[in-house]
Interface confidence: low
């Protein structure tokens, strides 16, 4: 049996994945639940099994096709339902008319690499993954650099207000270990949010040359 309020949040990665989280304030006793996606203009539908991620929330990924296939467009509406088994029946626990391109969260950028490193600066590049061609140039990025003795939360955010898949980090300390992360967000979509942060890229600046003033 289910009691209490629930929250059902989903994001589209712009290609072939809808990730959903369902939170339920009441007790959910050994019940099997799933998310069912029914597009309004496609001849397919998709289901995924909700798996617990905490005591009161469950998550699943609707895999709509090959990772880089464009499965939905800007005018698609997908009816998303949370269905939980009650005996031999399925009960609708939550429903939403999901507009994919209003609820975007892209995959984290990948293939981070150091292009060039010096004593005080480092040029880093990355690639976006599974991002729709619909966006063209309309993407922005945030980056952060982890310095020794600090946490990620303390790292200042660097904002790139255009589709620029590289950055030149300046005023770094010579011979110092750093980590770098980047995330991406389309400009489109009322409820669009930042991608997860990329995997950290570790790099070390070059030591200062002997006899030089640093």
């Amino acid at each position: 049996a289910v009691n209490g309020t629930s929250q059902f949040t989903c994001f589209y990665n712009s290609r072939a994945n809808i990730s959903c989280v369902w939170s339920q304030d009441g007790a959910l006793q050994d019940t099997s639940c799933q998310v069912h996606a029914w597009p309004d203009r496609r001849r397919w539908n998709q289901t995924c099994e909700l798996l617990p991620v905490s005591q009161a929330s469950w998550a699943c990924n609707l895999i709509l096709g090959a990772p880089d296939s464009q499965k939905l467009t800007t005018v698609d509406i997908v009816t998303l339902r949370v269905l939980c088994r009650e005996g031999v029946r399925w009960r609708v626990m939550a429903i939403q008319d999901f507009k994919p391109f209003e609820n975007l969260r892209l995959m984290a950028p990948i293939s981070l690499q150091v292009v060039h490193v010096e004593t005080h600066r480092c040029n880093i590049s990355w690639e976006i993954s599974q991002a729709s061609h619909y966006f063209e140039r309309h993407l922005e990025f945030e980056a952060r650099t982890l310095s020794p003795g600090h946490t990620w939360e303390e790292a200042p955010l660097l904002t790139l207000k255009q589709k620029q898949e590289w950055i030149c980090l300046e005023t770094l300390t010579p011979d110092t270990q750093y980590e770098f992360q980047v995330r991406v967000k389309p400009l489109q979509g009322e409820f669009t949010t930042w991608s997860p942060w990329s995997q950290p890229l570790a790099f070390r600046t070059k030591p200062a040359a002997l006899g030089k003033d640093t």
Partner: antibody, heavy 119, light 106 residues
């Protein structure tokens, strides 16, 4: 058999309001999006808006401030509330539903209800 | 909004003639639909997704096209085909229709 039946049309004065109904049978309104389309006398078709299966709505920007689409699930009926009506709103108003997917186009139409705005 | 321009606005043809109506979008569309409307009646879906025949529609009706330019054809005009025909795009909101083509028999 899918059927849509509009009602509520009639004569209304400029500045007045009217609520049209669209009674659906042969399907449940919580399973399909239902649209409103209008046609002025001797003119072409104009999309007004839609209420989706989950209850959210989309409108033609030309009508968003004056028209509201809603539904009563228990009656399996859709509504189009029209406010601040003007002579140019005189038209036959149709409700329409796509096939199993919007991909199939407006496969089902009501017979229409005539709204006349005149003093 | 995507403007759909139909041509011609009206035409007169003989029974058995091939009739062609074109619909041009102000920008590219992916999904095109064609409807038939007879006086005093609601529109009737003939063609969906550019070229697919709706259920129960005679095979003399057909559709084709891509991008901004689409074509609707009646291969052999019949007396019962006297009507106004509309194109409609479903690629972006608001949904928009062409202004209609009135088909008459000579």
């Amino acid at each position: 058999e899918v059927q849509l039946l509009e009602s509520g049309g009639g004569l209304v004065q400029p500045g007045g309001s009217l609520r049209l109904s669209c009674a659906a049978s042969g399907f449940t309104v919580t399973s399909y999006g239902v649209h409103w389309v209008r046609q002025a006398p001797g003119k072409g078709l104009e999309w007004v808006g839609v209420i989706w299966s989950g209850g959210s709505t989309d409108y033609n920007a030309a009508f968003i401030s004056r028209f509201t689409i809603s539904r009563d699930n228990s009656k399996n009926t859709l509504y189009l509330q029209m406010n601040s009506l003007q002579a140019e709103d005189t038209a036959i108003y149709y409700c329409a539903r796509a096939g199993d997917y919007n991909y199939d186009g407006f496969a089902y139409w009501g017979q229409g209800t005539l709204v006349t705005v005149s003093s | 909004d995507i403007q759909m321009t139909q041509s011609p606005s009206s035409l007169s043809a003989s029974v058995g003639d091939r009739v062609t109506i074109t619909c041009s979008g102000s920008s590219s569309v992916s999904f095109m639909y064609w409807y038939q409307q007879k006086p005093g009646k609601a529109p009737k879906l003939l063609i969906y997704d550019t070229s697919n025949l709706a259920s129960g529609v005679p095979s003399r009706f057909s559709g084709s096209g891509s991008g901004t330019d689409y074509t609707f054809t009646i291969s052999s005009l019949q007396p019962e085909d006297i009507a106004t025909y509309y194109c409609q795009q479903w690629s972006t909101y608001p949904l928009t229709f062409g202004q209609g083509t009135k088909v008459e028999v000579k």
